[in-house]
């Protein structure tokens, strides 16, 4: 699943994984 950037109760940031596909496959060869 993707997480979004934000601040949690312990002041740690959540890394945003939203720049990458959740279940990536290899690029098709053309």
């Amino acid at each position: 699943s993707e997480t979004t950037t934000g601040t949690s109760s312990n002041s740690s940031q959540s890394t945003s994984n939203s720049g990458l596909a959740p279940n990536p496959t290899n690029a098709t060869t053309k």
Epitope: S18, G19, A21, N26, A27, K30
Partner: antibody, heavy 115, light 112 residues
Framework: EVQFVESGGGLVQPGGSLKLSCAAS????????MDWVRQASGKGLEWVAE??????????YYAESVKGRFTISRDDSKSTAYLQMNSLKTEDTAIYYC??????WGQGTLVTVSS | DIVMTQTPLSLSVTIGQPASISCKSS???????????LNWLLQKPGQSPKRLIY???KLDPGIPDRFSGSGSETDFTLKISRVEAEDVGIYYC?????????FGGGTKVEIK
């Protein structure tokens, strides 16, 4: 403040090994998908490897150029990611950055492969 | 692999003026979930890269709104509405839709 600090770089001969570490702080490390990206001197960025989080079964992905030679791993209890590099080649010479899924980046560690 | 092609290679801009960078991918970056995983990063001189924009147009926290991203499928654009001195560096587009993740060759932005 989020910090990713890489270590373990240095000079190694072709065929040798190095293990890079990336210690994270100020971030919920266990949720982060961790990547290593490298940059040869004066060149662009090249993705190396990725390891996802526990809900994604710690799945790993590798660039074809390092597959079978490099191994990415993580220790969530230490908020640290690793890159074990074996059978190093001169073309592996670069600054190696760790990054949380391209979001936060470390300052990089220099790996030089030379005889 | 998906090839990311950026133009121009370099850009000399007057402070306060707009700037635009193009990025074209060799294959569509539209993922099966309807999202497009196109990122923009900036590497300032002597520093590590920093992500500015993800999913084509979403600004990362703390990124000034003078930056904007647009595009779809294979054609994308990063725009700076009014360039400031701190915007100098090399801008990279990067796709996160298909493995391996790939970056554009970079566009060097300098102040005229």
């Amino acid at each position: 403040e989020v910090q990713f600090v890489e270590s373990g770089g240095g000079l190694v001969q072709p065929g040798g090994s190095l293990k890079l570490s990336c210690a994270a702080s100020g971030v919920t490390f266990s949720e982060a998908w961790m990547d290593w990206v490298r940059q040869a001197s004066g060149k662009g960025l090249e993705w190396v490897a990725e390891i996802r989080d526990k809900p994604n079964s710690y799945v790993t992905y590798y660039a074809e150029s390092v597959k079978g030679r490099f191994t990415i791993s993580r220790d969530d209890s230490k908020s640290t990611a690793y890159l074990q590099m074996n059978s190093l080649k001169t073309e592996d010479t670069a600054i190696y950055y760790c990054t949380g899924a391209m979001d936060y980046w470390g300052q990089g560690t220099l790996v030089t492969v030379s005889s | 692999d998906i090839v990311m092609t950026q133009t121009p290679l370099s850009l000399s801009v007057t402070i306060g003026q707009p700037a635009s960078i193009s990025c074209k991918s060799s294959q569509s970056l539209l993922y099966s979930n309807g999202k497009t995983y196109l990122n923009w990063l900036l590497q300032k001189p002597g520093q590590s890269p920093k992500r500015l924009i993800y999913q084509v147009s979403k600004l990362d926290p703390g990124i000034p709104d003078r930056f904007s991203g647009s595009g779809s499928e294979t054609d994308f654009t990063l725009k700076i509405s009014r360039v400031e001195a701190e915007d100098v560096g090399i801008y990279y587009c990067m796709q996160g839709s298909s493995l391996p993740w790939t970056f554009g060759g970079g566009t060097k932005v300098e102040i005229k």
